[in-house]
């Protein structure tokens, strides 16, 4: 039997049953999430659920740039240090880059400091690049 790999939207890349779109537009976190949703297919800002997934994404983004942080789908909507993925995935894998205390930082970004393998919290109104994800 020939098993066809699902195709992703033009400009998106495929990895392990998911499609990812990296957008080098500047958006705040909530506008980035709305834009991800606007692409359909159940897309959201990306959840990153394993080191393998993180490494694949980091390698892809490093081919474009190495200095700008990128919004992902992790946030703290009630401002209670109870972080959650916007797509409903379980918050099990974590790759924070150390402590980040105070300052109303309730949205997560992939940090350029460690080649996009680790995350930092930031103020949700910052305008940054963003990464979307959906399952085709």
């Amino acid at each position: 039997d020939i098993i066809m790999r699902p195709s992703c939207a033009p400009g998106w890349f495929y990895h392990k049953s998911n499609c990812y779109g990296y957008f080098r537009k500047l958006r705040n976190w909530s506008d980035a999430e709305l834009e991800c949703q606007s692409y359909g297919n159940g897309a959201h800002l990306a959840s990153i659920l394993s080191l393998k997934e993180a490494s694949t994404i980091a390698e892809y983004i490093s081919g474009y740039q190495r200095s700008q942080p990128i919004w992902i789908g992790l946030h703290d909507p009630q401002k209670r240090q109870q972080w959650q993925w916007i797509d409903g995935a379980m918050y099990l894998y974590r790759s924070w880059s150390g402590k980040s205390m105070g300052g109303n930082k309730h949205c997560a970004e992939m940090s350029s400091n460690n080649n996009f393998l680790t995350w930092s919290s930031n103020e949700c109104n910052k305008r940054q690049h963003f990464l979307c994800k959906y399952r085709p």
Epitope: K79, R80, Q82, Y91, L92, N104
Partner: antibody
Framework: EVKVVASGGILVQPGGSLKLSCIVS????????MSWVRQNPEKRLEWVAE????????HYPDTVKGRFIVSRDNDNNILYLQMNSLKSEDTAMYYC???????????????WGQGTSVTVSS | DVLMTQTPLSLSVSLGDQASISCRSS???????????LEWYLQKPGQSPKLLMY???NRFSGVPDRFSGSGSGTDFTLKISRVEAEDLGLYYC?????????FGGGTNLEIK
Amino acid sequence: EVKVVASGGILVQPGGSLKLSCIVSGFTFRSYIMSWVRQNPEKRLEWVAEINDGGSYTHYPDTVKGRFIVSRDNDNNILYLQMNSLKSEDTAMYYCVRHGSNGYDYFGMDYWGQGTSVTVSS
Amino acid sequence: DVLMTQTPLSLSVSLGDQASISCRSSQTIAHRNGITYLEWYLQKPGQSPKLLMYKVSNRFSGVPDRFSGSGSGTDFTLKISRVEAEDLGLYYCFQNSHLPPTFGGGTNLEIK
């Protein structure tokens, strides 16, 4: 050493107002979520207010919503609880509490003050 | 609101024996992120409550390893493997997964 010292509790008449204060030291106050928890004379504990690190987000249970206001002064390390339209059922020991966190995770209410007693009675 | 029900209300235990306190919630207290923010507090006579356990089974720093927490969904248990005199007091469970956070009614541990 972490210190959490609440004050302001007194005897007040029903319908009256009161402002509790909590002065903290020994940690970076502006980095932590803070709450007020009360314990009634029957020893029941009730969470009554919470405020995030920056002071821009608050949460209350229905029992005090619209009557109590939590606020904070991050420059002077003070947590406040403004209590209005007080009722007899607000009679309790009020504790000022720190929420343990590293910014990415919540570890429980790790430091409690000694409490300040509020009695609402005519 | 999530109702937290503790049993028993009172517990009398001999020194060195095991004590077990149950806490049941009226609905599942797993947060939508998958973590269960269930805590246990001990209030010794004349003192403020102190944190014992967080996220069901994690001991707070300085808490002896004779204390252990377990459970999931709606049923949770705090066990003290060998009760010591300093363990007497009021034990409270607390859920912080859903607003408003709520406490159990308390269990009074006495030493026989």
